[in-house]
């Protein structure tokens, strides 16, 4: 017996699509071997029509695809635009066509349902609107107009021109009689339900001279689009429901049991707690279309998602919907990286951000996820030399260590820095990750003076005290600018006396500025690193003033002032800064969502809160 399983008989009608799922044991070999769909010939051979290695027969060109889902042990063959010629015996299988790992499938494509003569077929999606047109003759112009639905053997009145409406259609049906010139009435049914499907009869007049017209209404439940994304990666659901629902509340929900569909996010401000920090609902276009980005994909995110429109912001009968089946591939190309980084007030964090190593030249970005309204992610820094004004001197994006990872350093932490941050690039949109910064109790490890004033033309020495835990780390000083932090020469002054219970391995490393000029004014960082991996940093602002008295300045911790006032973050520090987005590809596939740099709503951005790994703020 073959271990492959699938549908033995598939019956469809011309013009339709089929989606055939074949199940296989998900062993390592099976997951990666060739998958195929072939048609059995009269002499017993099986001619490949499509395979997972990219082959598509000319018979299937432009109308079929084969998708492998190794995690589930399934592959799916989609075939569209069916004709009766597609009827026949097929095999879905693994490996080579002639070997035994296959399953026989019979596909029968018929002309369609037997309909009464002169029956008009209306095929409409669930939740949409249908207009059934009913012609009549002049002698019935003044007579009663009605629409019946065939229920079993009996016609049941749905609506008529005297004002009757069947309770099942209340609030969503109307009968329109055209002007005197046109011998036509029409029945418009909104918010179509699956139960509305069936045979209808419209009638003008009630006697033997009445005009009758048959209609067959088919209400289609949307086929879910199969979406296959990597664990820790990102998915974007594009939802286009049409202009008729442009002003109706939109939602994305995930089907749980049965018809229950739990709201993931909606435009009324609801968001499921499991998606906190890793979801954005992009502002909708005038045509009512919108998109939802979910990042940091977890195994449990797999499932069926529906987007729709309803005033309640959740799925109701008659909501127009679109559907997706999301599969999350655990054999992910996206590396694990810490999803939580902890830092202390006044201290720093160094965040590692993965990106697709094939796109080393892409622009790197870091943004702060904000949950207000539908979520947004204003940019804070990029690799092109832009830093949001309120973050000057305390935020830097470094291309190191490179080869698929960049580093973001944020220091002078306050409790307001706690939150979710997204790493993204203008390249592969699936490589968007998130990290949550948590501010915990404790003291910064590195000790530096608060702010320092240097005198023009003199020498300035600024100390940085490193505790013994960093004895094996490289210690450095650098001058911050918006493209990074340029290394400066520094002197090891021996053990530090700034730490209690710390031995000879503590260090005092000083920065010396000789013959200070105006250009020396700015932010200086001292920090630790191991190779290209950065650890904790501390920042000092050096102001430069005219000479008052001769001599050099040697700053000690005791003389340290508070950090300069102009750098204190006020409550408005997340306000939008009017900086235009330079690269339209950053949010490719979406309309330019926002007109300011800050509003690059991460519409194609991503997060990784997919695991509980944590990283301390100071060292790797």
């Amino acid at each position: 017996k073959s271990p492959i399983f699938g549908p033995e008989e598939v019956n469809s009608v011309e013009g339709n699509s089929v989606s055939i799922t074949c199940y296989y044991p998900p062993t390592s070999v099976n997951r990666h071997t060739r998958k195929y769909w072939c048609r059995q010939g009269a002499r017993g051979g099986c001619i490949t029509l499509i395979s997972s290695e990219g082959y598509v027969s000319s018979k299937y060109a432009g109308r079929a695809n084969l998708t492998n889902f190794p995690e589930n042990g399934t592959f799916v063959v989609n075939i569209a635009q069916l004709s009766q010629d597609d009827s026949g015996r097929y095999k879905c299988g693994l490996g080579i066509n002639s070997r035994g790992l296959s399953f026989d499938v019979s596909l029968e494509v018929s002309q369609g349902p037997g309909l009464l003569n002169d029956t008009k077929v209306y095929t409409v999606d669930l939740g949409r609107t249908v207009t059934i047109n009913c012609p009549f003759k002049t002698e019935n112009a003044q007579k009663r107009k009605s629409l019946y639905k065939q229920i079993g053997l009996y016609p049941v009145l749905v609506i008529d021109s005297s004002g009757y409406v069947n309770p099942n259609y209340t609030g969503r049906i109307r009968l329109d009689i055209q002007g005197t010139g046109q011998l036509l009435f029409s029945v418009v049914i909104n918010q179509l339900r699956l139960s509305d499907a069936g045979q209808y009869l419209c009638q003008a007049g009630d006697d033997s001279n009445s005009n009758k017209k048959n209609a067959d209404l088919q209400v289609l439940k949307p086929e879910p689009e199969l979406v296959y994304e990597d664990l820790r990666g990102s998915v974007t659901f594009h939802c286009a429901l049409g202009p008729e629902v442009a002003n109706v509340a939109k939602f994305l929900c995930r089907q749980s049991s049965g018809e229950n569909c739990d709201v993931v996010v909606n435009t009324l401000g609801k968001r499921a707690p499991a998606f906190e920090g890793r979801i954005l609902l992009n502002p909708q276009d005038k045509d009512g279309s919108f998109s939802v980005v979910i990042t940091g994909l977890r195994k449990e995110d797999a499932g069926r998602y529906l987007c729709g429109a309803h005033s309640d912001g959740q799925l109701q009968e008659g909501s127009p919907i679109q559907a997706w089946q999301l599969f999350v591939n655990e054999e992910s190309t996206i590396p694990r990286s810490p999803t939580v980084v902890k830092g202390v007030a006044g201290g720093s964090v160094a965040v590692l951000c993965p990106y697709n190593r094939k796109e080393s030249k892409s622009i790197k970005y870091w943004c702060l996820w904000e949950g207000a309204q539908n979520g947004r992610c204003p940019l804070l820094v990029d690799s092109e030399g832009w830093v949001k004004a309120q973050y000057e001197g305390r935020l830097s994006l470094l291309e190191e260590p490179g080869n698929g990872t960049f580093t973001v350093i944020l220091n002078q932490l306050t409790s307001r820095d706690a939150g979710f941050y997204w790493c993204l690039t203008n390249g592969d949109t699936l490589w968007r990750t998130t990290v949550e910064i948590k501010i915990i109790e404790g003291e910064p490890n590195l000790k530096v003076p608060g702010n320092v004033t240097a005198v023009l033309g003199e020498t300035l020495k600024v100390p940085c005290h490193f505790p013994c835990k960093f004895s094996s780390y490289e210690k450095y000083w650098c001058k911050w600018n918006n493209t990074g932090c340029q290394a400066l020469p520094s002197q090891d002054e021996g053990p530090s006396k700034a730490f209690v219970n710390c031995d000879e391995n503590s260090r005092l490393v000083s920065l010396t500025l000789n013959l200070v000029t105006r250009a020396d004014e700015g932010w200086y960082w001292c920090g630790v690193k191991q190779g290209h991996f950065y650890g904790e940093t501390a920042a000092v602002y050096v102001a430069v003033e005219e000479r008052k008295a001769a001599g050099s300045r040697d700053v000690s911790l005791a003389k340290a002032d508070a950090a300069p006032d102009e750098k204190v973050l006020d409550s408005g520090f997340r306000e939008i800064e009017n900086k235009a987005i330079q690269d339209p590809r950053l949010f490719a596939e979406e309309k330019a969502v926002a007109d300011t740099r800050d509003q690059a709503d991460g519409s194609r951005a991503s997060v990784d809160s997919g695991s509980s790994e944590e990283q301390g703020g100071s060292s790797r």
Epitope: P7, V10, S12, E223, P224
Partner: nanobody, 127 residues
Framework: QVQLVESGGGLVQPGGSLRLSCVAS????????MAWFAQAPGKEREFVAA??????????YYADSVKGRFTVSGDNAKKTLDLQMKDLKPEDTALYFC??????????????????WGQGTQVTVSS
């Protein structure tokens, strides 16, 4: 209240035939997949056959043990499911359950992929 009611079970001789029927009422949807499972005394429920609907396409699935002997059919709109059983064998003796689910996805052979269940109808094949 959702109800799936099976009928058509009974005692039949080996080689004989039976037709099982299932009618669903109170379902909040036109079911997208319905199936038959069999449970022999002291054993787990086993998949027998299923039918799934997507739009105007139907998909029929069978267990290896019943291929060529059993035929599944149904009406999505009427929420009915039938199982025509021919050439019955003593090992087909079991309590036959009807199951339904709103979506035609997931492996149809796995009982956990169905939300609604009937009470069962007994089929006994014995001479």
């Amino acid at each position: 209240q959702v109800q799936l009611v099976e009928s058509g079970g009974g005692l039949v001789q080996p080689g004989g035939s039976l037709r099982l029927s299932c009618v669903a009422s109170g379902l909040p949807f036109s079911s997208s997949r319905m199936a038959w499972f069999a449970q022999a005394p002291g054993k787990e429920r086993e998949f027998v056959a299923a039918i799934g609907w997507r739009g105007r396409t139907s998909y029929k699935y069978y267990a290896d043990s019943v291929k060529g002997r059993f035929t599944v059919s149904g009406d999505n709109a009427k929420k009915t499911l039938d199982l025509q059983m021919k050439d019955l064998k003593p090992e087909d003796t079991a309590l036959y359950f009807c199951a339904a689910h709103p979506n035609d996805d997931g492996d149809p052979r796995i009982s956990g992929n169905y939300q609604y269940w009937g009470q069962g109808t007994q089929v006994t094949v014995s001479s």
